[in-house]
Amino acid sequence: HNTTVFQGVAGQSLQVSCPYDSMKHWGRRKAWCRQLGEKGPCQRVVSTHNLWLLSFLRRWNGSTAITDDTLGGTLTITLRNLQPHDAGLYQCQSLHGSEADTLRKVLVEVLADPLDHRDAGDLWFPGESESFEDAHVEHSISRSLLEGEIPFPPTS
């Protein structure tokens, strides 16, 4: 699986979207988990409603919410009041029995608030001049950089 990078700003909310084939994953609950190590398990953070028909209802675990558009085929995760410790590698999963298929691997980056201790005339957007090479980067402020994706984790 390739990895998509989502960048958010500390203190703000970040929305992560995971598109999937609605027919292939029909009837399946979804989950959002965090990769604990290079070869470690993916620890469940939050999952959609126990009743698949109610998957559109937003479910929260702490500051993380999940909702599933089962017809459109888009799983949406919201990380509220983003903090540096939220940075990490996550997965959107489709559940079937005790198994889980990875829908998307997501790298969440948390940047400093560009408005912290700055005048509006001195506005700075993190990473604006960066070259993200092959990474597909999505921002909570809706700015996209280069398309394409990078493998993760890479082989050493």
Epitope: H85, A87, G88, L107, E109, V110, G127, F152
Partner: antibody, heavy 121, light 107 residues
Framework: QVQLVQSGAEVKKPGASVKVSCKAS????????MHWVRQAPGQGLEWMGW????????NYAQKFQGRVTMTRDTSISTAYMELSRLRSDDTAVYYC??????????????WGQGTMVTVSS | EIVLTQSPATLSLSPGERATLSCRAS??????LAWYQQKPGQAPRLLIY???NRATGIPARFSGSGSGTDFTLTISSLEPEDFAVYYC?????????FGGGTKVEIK
């Protein structure tokens, strides 16, 4: 074993730039954030920012914004920190340090040996 | 930015004694606090992360406690090699900041 090896000491004139390198070995370079921390002679530690070697994403302390640039070359597992418009108070030992967390921010567990940068006219 | 205040600035103790170092944050950092040891001419070494978790290879005589704004690093029985400068660091909010350090010296 996991280690970070930094480039050698530098002497620069005020207004010049310096670029310090940090070569990583013994682990998956792209899996861990790399931080840069400096320490002026006889002083404490000062965090400058991080780079995510996977995406190339960076985050700098406001104090260094506009003067610091962190980059990486994944093909040779090396991170770089460039500081421009050097002043005498930039004289310090500059450390690269790997984050303990896998693609996350926890603490700085592996440190380079440090690079002494002296700014003097 | 979050200011970390370490006390005392200097701690004069003898080998075998118990050392208690304090780190106070200007606002809550939850448990996102680390402790480092630094000896002259060397890079810092991570001792404790997440306030109370010992890093790999760190002896059991080092322990960390606290949450919110008040944190403590305890060295239960000082060994000769423990005399050094100790720094706390918060990774809760940007910019990540360090305390000013506590020097543990031989009495």
């Amino acid at each position: 074993q996991v280690q970070l090896v930094q480039s050698g000491a530098e002497v620069k004139k005020p207004g010049a730039s310096v670029k310090v390198s940090c070569k990583a070995s013994g682990y998956t370079f792209t899996g861990y954030y790399m931080h840069w921390v400096r320490q002026a002679p006889g002083q404490g530690l000062e965090w400058m920012g991080w780079i995510n070697p996977n995406s190339g994403g960076t985050n700098y302390a406001q104090k260094f914004q506009g003067r610091v640039t962190m980059t990486r070359d994944t093909s040779i597992s090396t991170a770089y920190m460039e500081l421009s418009r050097l002043r005498s108070d930039d004289t310090a030992v500059y450390y690269c340090a790997r984050d303990l967390g896998y693609s996350s921010l926890l603490a700085l567990d592996i440190w380079g040996q440090g690079t002494m940068v002296t700014v003097s006219s | 930015e979050i200011v970390l205040t370490q006390s005392p600035a200097t701690l004069s103790l003898s080998p075998g004694e118990r050392a208690t170092l304090s780190c106070r944050a200007s606002q809550s950092v939850s448990s996102y606090l680390a402790w480092y040891q630094q000896k002259p001419g060397q890079a810092p070494r991570l001792l404790i992360y997440d306030a109370s978790n010992r890093a790999t290879g760190i002896p059991a005589r080092f322990s960390g406690s606290g949450s919110g704004t008040d944190f403590t690093l305890t060295i239960s029985s000082l060994e000769p090699e423990d005399f050094a400068v100790y720094y706390c660091q918060q990774v809760s909010n940007y910019p990540f900041t360090f305390g000013g350090g506590t020097k543990v010296e031989i009495k």
